[in-house]
């Protein structure tokens, strides 16, 4: 559905007449080269047509850029977010160049007023890097811009600009009203940079859609689904900050774009994975678990560079704080008989026990229903490494320990009241590792006792084959 | 307010080439794409190209790659197109349009037609 | 490429009637279509653009609506002067591609 209001000005208004912002003394586009990762430490600003600043504060030209581009701001300061990303950045990179990009003035209008901004600090950004590339050694090869919200399609409007090509954009969470379903060339696009990889983190089919749906880059991730995030629900945030408010829960989900990448910049011995997929329903059957074909990749800073013809989504699940990582098991469910079902479907619990520890007990999301004589997909996610798996228990939830099912039974006993009991048929359970690619077949403890019914549980252990690799290819950074 | 004038008819000769300008007044000029639309009698639009003209970065129709140049003047705020190896087949309107939410504004049209 | 179909050639309608064009994407461009309007001898207009937003002075009478493969722009209360072929096209990917068109007639 349309975004409550649609892009506003003309292209007449545009550039060509400055606001009185743009003719103030100081420049509503700033570029703070910071030479610390001290958010106290004033840094270096750098213009163009002056070198001495680039000489005076060691500007690598070899090395790696990274441009900080924040978005619309309601408080005209910059926020936390972006020294963390800052000193992450340095920490990673230690020879690289950070700069900031400061649009404050800019970006603390109405939003509208904001989003007509973008174009312009864009031009700027641009203007920056045609002169850098003036210099001996600067290429734009190593130029990685980093916009977030509103500040993803500034970085858009650079590498859209620039006389050449940026080596990458990374949007994070890119600003969704005004933009969704924009041309090309108005907001962030793949023919922006070399890569282009974007995070979405708070998606709304309906009502207001804070961040971008539309895929917008060679690769699009949406942690959670792209919705809603772990440790950013209401109780969650009303539990941590004193008069938690929805503005923080928006911002917590909207803001969690930067957290994910900072994260993979200071926990790169923890790398998310995720994994390629139509939609998020289809992820959340545990359907799209592969690593064949580029089908999945390292998110945020360690994303391997993809250039395929069509827009890859990904999904994957993260914890509710850093490190984000979780490791995403498939399991597959063949159901080969089931006796008086009614209307009712099953409640499933599976426990995951492993050489290096076991899960907690985990909910078996039935995203449409249990099919019988058909093998029924899921998708669970763990925490913790739990190694190599050795059994699961898989529990089937009594009705009693639901209010909801146990109205359902209820009704279901209204109509059918001789409905006897109910029971399912499970010999064997396959699962895939994500993390590792790595298929296991587990068999029932008692071949005699395949049966399940509410209230009860069924063990599972690993089948005489073992582990089998099918000639998967596992993700592409080598797991701790 | 935005305007684009569009070079006048054409006549060519078989093989030959032809360049076509596009005049832009009322923005400005380097910061927006210009594209080229092919129109032959009583077909559709058929995008051809487009030029970004501050940086001079093109993107075309695979169709067209070896068929149209673009090039453009910001000195004089003018856009052109060049049509090379003229066949019967590149008779048509040729449309150049400013880009902004979509084709925000277009050029008059001009006409070239090939023949012997 | 994206294929951009519109199904009809041809729609015949009168004057205060309301009539509906639609167009189908080959692939999901989601809301990014852009709808024109070319009277006989004129270049096109644009009248809509990320698949429901009209565009400057645009009469209201023009709407359009749609998202993933399939958008509908309709006319409210046709006019003499609506008498035109009208085009959608995708503004999700490069190459740009427009439907075939459909020309709007008046009884």
């Known amino acids: 559905s349309p975004v409550p209001f649609g892009p506003e000005g003309r292209l007449e208004d545009k550039l060509h007449k400055p606001k009185a912002t743009q003719t103030e003394v100081k420049p509503s586009v700033r570029f703070n080269l910071r030479t610390s990762k001290d958010p106290e430490h004033e840094g270096c600003y750098l213009s163009v047509g002056h070198s001495q600043p680039l000489e005076d504060c060691s500007f690598n030209m070899t090395a790696k850029t990274f441009f900080i581009i924040h978005g619309w701001t309601m408080s005209g300061i910059f926020e936390n977010w972006l020294h963390k990303l800052v000193s992450a950045l340095h920490t990673r990179e230690k020879d690289a160049n950070v700069v900031v990009v400061d649009w404050l003035p800019l970006a603390h209008q109405l939003y509208t007023d904001a989003v007509n901004n973008t174009r312009v600090v864009g031009h700027s950004i641009a203007r920056m890097l045609d002169w850098l590339q003036e210099k001996d050694d600067f290429s734009l090869g190593n130029v990685h811009l980093i916009g977030y919200s509103l500040g993803a399609h500034v970085a858009g409007y650079a590498g859209n600009f620039v006389k050449g090509t940026v080596g990458r954009i990374t949007g994070l969470d890119p600003a969704g009203p005004m933009f969704e379903g924009a041309d090309i060339h108005k907001r962030l696009s793949p023919d922006d940079a070399d890569f282009v990889d974007v995070l979405h983190t708070y998606t709304r089919s309906f009502g207001l859609s804070i961040g971008i749906q539309m895929p917008v880059g060679h690769i699009d991730i949406y942690p959670n689904g792209g919705d809603f995030q772990p440790g950013c629900g209401l109780n969650d945030v009303l539990g941590s900050i004193a008069y938690g408010t929805i503005t923080e829960v928006v911002k917590c989900e909207h803001e969690r774009a930067v957290h994910l990448f900072v994260d993979s910049l200071v926990n790169q011995d923890k790398p998310s994975f995720a994994f390629q997929c139509t939609d998020s329903n289809r992820f959340k059957k545990g359907i799209c678990l592969s690593c064949r074909k580029n089908r999945c990749n390292s998110i945020g800073y360690n994303a391997k560079k993809m250039r395929n013809k069509r827009n890859s989504k990904m999904y994957l699940k993260t914890r509710a704080g850093m490190p984000f990582r979780v490791y995403h098991y498939q399991m597959k469910i063949h159901v080969f008989s089931y006796k008086n079902m009614g209307e009712i479907e099953p409640t499933f619990y599976v426990t995951l026990y492993g050489t290096n520890a076991d899960s907690q007990t985990l909910p078996l999301e039935i995203v449409e229903r249990i099919e019988q004589n058909a093998t029924n997909t899921f998708l669970v996610y763990t925490e913790e490494d739990l190694g190599d798996l050795l059994k699961i228990q898989l529990t089937w939830e009594g009705a009693s320990q639901s209010w909801y099912n146990l109205w359902k039974e209820f009704r279901s006993y209204l109509s059918q009241p001789r409905n006897p009991g109910r029971e399912l048929n499970i010999r064997r359970i396959r699962v895939k590792s994500g993390e590792t690619q790595r298929k296991l077949t587990f068999c029932t403890e008692d071949p005699e006792n395949t049966s399940i019914s509410p209230g009860r549980e069924l063990w599972f252990r690993k089948c005489r084959d073992g582990w089998r690799m099918k000639n998967e290819t596992s993700p592409t950074v080598e797991l701790p | 307010q935005v305007q684009l004038q569009q070079s006048g008819a054409e006549l060519m000769k078989p093989g030959a080439s032809v360049k076509i300008s596009c005049k832009a007044t009322?923005?400005?000029?380097?910061?927006?794409?210009i594209a080229w639309v092919k129109q032959r009698p009583g077909h559709g639009l058929e995008w051809i190209g487009e030029?970004?003209?501050?940086?001079?970065?093109?993107k075309y129709n695979k169709k067209f790659k070896g068929k149209a140049t673009f090039t453009a003047d910001t000195s004089s705020n003018t856009a052109y197109m060049q049509l090379s190896s003229l066949t019967s087949e590149d008779s048509a309107v040729y449309y150049c349009?400013?880009?902004?939410?979509?084709?925000?504004?277009w050029g008059q049209g001009t006409s070239v037609t090939v023949s012997s | 490429d994206i294929v951009m179909t519109q199904s009809h050639k041809f729609m015949s309608t009168s004057v205060g009637d309301r009539v509906s064009i639609t167009c189908k994407a080959s692939?999901?461009?989601?809301?990014?279509v852009a709808w024109y309007q070319q009277k006989p001898g004129q270049s096109p207009k644009l009248l809509i653009y990320?698949?429901?937003y009209r565009f400057t002075g645009v009469p209201d009478r023009f709407t359009g609506s749609g998202a993933g493969t399939e958008f509908t722009f309709t006319i409210n209360s046709v006019q003499a002067e609506d008498l035109a072929v009208y085009y959608c096209?995708?503004?999700?990917?490069?190459?740009?591609?427009f439907g075939g068109g459909t020309k709007l007639e008046i009884k």
């Open positions: 349009a400013v880009y902004d939410y979509g084709a925000d504004y």
């Open positions: 096209q995708q503004h999700y990917s490069i190459p740009r591609t």
């Open positions: 692939q999901d461009v989601y809301t990014a």
């Open positions: 009322g923005y400005t000029f380097s910061t927006y794409w």
């Open positions: 990320s698949a429901s």
């Open positions: 030029i970004l003209p501050g940086s001079a970065k093109t």
